[in-house]
Amino acid sequence: APTSSSTKKTQLQLEHLLLDLQMILNGINNYKNPKLTRMLTFKFYMPKKATELKHLQCLEEELGPLEEVLNLAQSKNFHLRPRDLISNIRVIVLELKGSETTFMCEYADETATIVEFLNRWITFCQSIISTLT
């Protein structure tokens, strides 16, 4: 059974991930973002189901494309370079889902824009955090 300290650590990691995803979304939605139209053409794949930490595998598999989209945006829209930002997210995701369990992600049939994708994972983080508090 998870201890209170491990639950707290998980909660903090999720909050960190949530903030990173919200920061990216805010940077993309910035009215000064000239690349938004092109960014919205990138197709992102959504999980069929995202209710547990193991489902973060589906997010991890989309972080490569996410980095490429962020490379299009002006760097001043974000506090960090896309490579560093994604690297930070990868570390958090890996700690949350674990590196040993090889969960096979199942994707929904419909693809999403980067905005829909980020909103989905922001909702996921908020949902898990709410169950921990």
């Epitope: 197709k43 991890e60 598999e61 490569g64 490379n71």
Partner: antibody
């Protein structure tokens, strides 16, 4: 169906520069990140770098920085790879290949390849 | 840079046999790994992407699996046209790197 057609074989002297082309047909080049990979005779595959033809941003492998320039001409849907200060170790088959994030997950990998261009560096 | 180590360097088998090719990453790369087949004088061909997904037009006898940083390409029953060189490739971070290849030859 997307096809990549590369320019013909080249023979160059050490110190010279070579420029190889890769024409995309079946789609617009701006839908793809154009990558270049090389293979020395009897050896494995080595990633050189890539270009996003939509905004001309490039990424290069450290080994090639300063010697390689990847460009793209969106009016002709053609990508180019120029390698300077050639030496005998650059003798290889050079391939162009693609990645896109606009279509299926499969096409996020090197799904389409050119036929390869043999570059021979010899004095 | 991420190093991919393929083994064995050469695999000698007969048609109808099962082939198991290995690719080990020097660090965690998730599922950011693909497998390619290359025949003499030809460009590589995508077989497996995202570690386990079969590329379109590739026969079902090819499959990919992953355990941590160890990746496996399995050919369930070898056909004569399967004898070639196989490479793994990681897309986790640039520079993208390939394994050194496994030559699958007829015994």
């Amino acid at each position: 169906q997307v096809q990549l057609v590369q320019s013909g074989a080249e023979v160059k002297k050490p110190g010279a520069t070579v420029k190889i082309s890769c024409k995309v047909s079946g789609d617009t080049i701006t839908a793809y990140y154009m990558h270049w990979v090389r293979q020395a005779p009897g050896q494995g595959l080595e990633w050189i770098g890539r270009i996003d033809p939509d905004d001309d941003s490039t990424k290069y492998a450290e080994n090639f920085k300063g010697r390689v320039t990847i460009t793209a001409d969106t009016s002709t849907d053609t990508a180019y790879m120029e390698l300077s200060s050639l030496r005998s170790e650059d003798t290889a088959v050079y391939y162009c290949t693609t990645i896109t994030f606009l279509y299926s997950r499969e096409l996020r990998w090197f799904a389409y390849w050119g036929q390869g261009t043999l570059v021979t560096v010899s004095s | 840079d991420i190093v991919l180590t393929q083994s064995p360097a050469t695999l000698s088998l007969s048609p109808g046999e099962r082939a198991t090719l290995s690719c080990q990453a020097s660090q965690y790369i998730g599922n950011y790994l693909s497998w390619y087949q290359q025949k003499p004088g030809q460009a590589p061909r995508l077989l497996i992407y995202s570690a386990t997904s079969l590329a379109s037009g590739i026969p079902a006898r090819f499959s990919g699996s992953r355990s941590g940083t160890d990746f496996t390409l399995t050919i369930s029953s070898l056909e004569p046209e399967d004898f070639a060189v196989y490479y793994c490739l990681q897309h986790y971070s640039t520079p993208y790197t390939f394994g050194q290849g496994t030559k699958l030859e007829i015994k």
